[in-house]
């Protein structure tokens, strides 16, 4: 079954630093994001080969990309408090996989003593749970049906 | 530029079934909600059912809950509608509509399709 392998598990940086995110699958995808998760998921970038990436606004000018979306290396820079998260690889397959995730932790330089991170990866609790195999449940629901456009907004 | 194209629409007899399409082309796919609206003559347009960006939740309208079911490809950016147990009632033109939610890199962006009629009759 498709995978994604997404490392390093925890990164501890202190604010204004750059960190790597990388994320690599067997291939055979259509293109892939990086997701912030939380009670919104949030897209970061989606990385498409041969397609110019799109950046969430509160990250252009701050995100680097290396390598092609089989095996993708994200580096964000310049790291803000505000930045500190937990961030995982999806790749766009037949079936929906994600990577185990990443949890970024950014801190005051003088307090990065208090705030480490462990060697097992980030706390279940802040991914969606997984079913049985790599495949996940989409974390980012629709409970409700839109609400129709307007009027005006018809062709 | 951004197209929404329907297709599989015609004419079918109370009980038959049709399978809609929609291709995608000019956006990122995967970054949408998608949802398939209908309009009867003299009716207004209204909304069939509609499929997460990822696949992982459906709604439907409660008169074709248990008879259509909405799926999508995001490899081939494409969005379906199966229609079983058509009754008269079902005849419309079938739109397609994408919708970027909260959380997307396009949040708010949202595309409509041209069309395709759907006629149950006997």
């Known amino acids: 079954a498709q995978e994604v392998q997404q490392s390093p598990h925890c990164t501890t940086v202190p604010v204004g630093a750059s960190v790597n995110i990388t994320c690599s699958t067997s291939g055979g995808l259509r293109g892939i994001y990086l997701r912030q998760l939380g009670p919104q998921p949030q897209d970061i970038i989606y990385y498409e080969d041969g397609v110019v990436p799109t950046t969430d606004r509160r990250f252009r000018g701050r995100i680097d990309f290396s390598g092609s979306q089989d095996n993708l290396t994200i580096t964000m820079h310049r790291l803000q408090l505000s930045d500190t998260g937990t961030y995982t690889c999806q790749a766009i397959t037949e079936v929906n996989v994600y990577g185990s995730g990443t949890l970024v932790l950014v801190t005051e330089e003088q307090s990065q003593g208090w705030h480490r991170c462990s060697d097992a990866p980030p706390r279940a609790s802040a991914l969606p749970a997984p079913p049985t195999g790599s495949a996940l449940p989409d974390p980012q629901t629709a409970s409700a049906l839109p609400d129709p456009p307007a009027a005006s907004a018809l062709p | 530029q951004v197209q929404l194209v329907e297709s599989g629409g015609g004419l079918v007899q109370p009980g038959g079934s049709l399978r809609l399409s929609c291709a995608a082309s000019?956006?990122?796919?995967?970054?949408?909600?998608m949802s398939w609206y209908r309009q009867a003559p003299g009716k207004e347009r209204e909304l069939v059912a509609t499929?997460?960006?990822?696949?992982?939740?459906?709604n439907y309208e409660d008169s074709v809950k248990g008879r259509f079911t909405i799926s999508r490809d995001n490899v081939k950016d494409t969005v379906y509608l199966q229609m079983n147990s058509l009754k008269p009632e079902d005849t419309a033109v079938y739109y397609c509509?994408?919708?970027?939610?909260?959380?997307?890199?396009?949040?708010?962006?949202?595309?409509w399709g041209q069309g395709t009629q759907v006629t149950v009759s006997s």
């Open positions: 499929i997460s960006r990822f696949g992982g939740s459906s």
């Open positions: 509509y994408a919708l970027a939610p909260a959380g997307s890199l396009w949040h708010g962006d949202n595309y």
């Open positions: 000019g956006f990122t796919f995967s970054g949408f909600d």
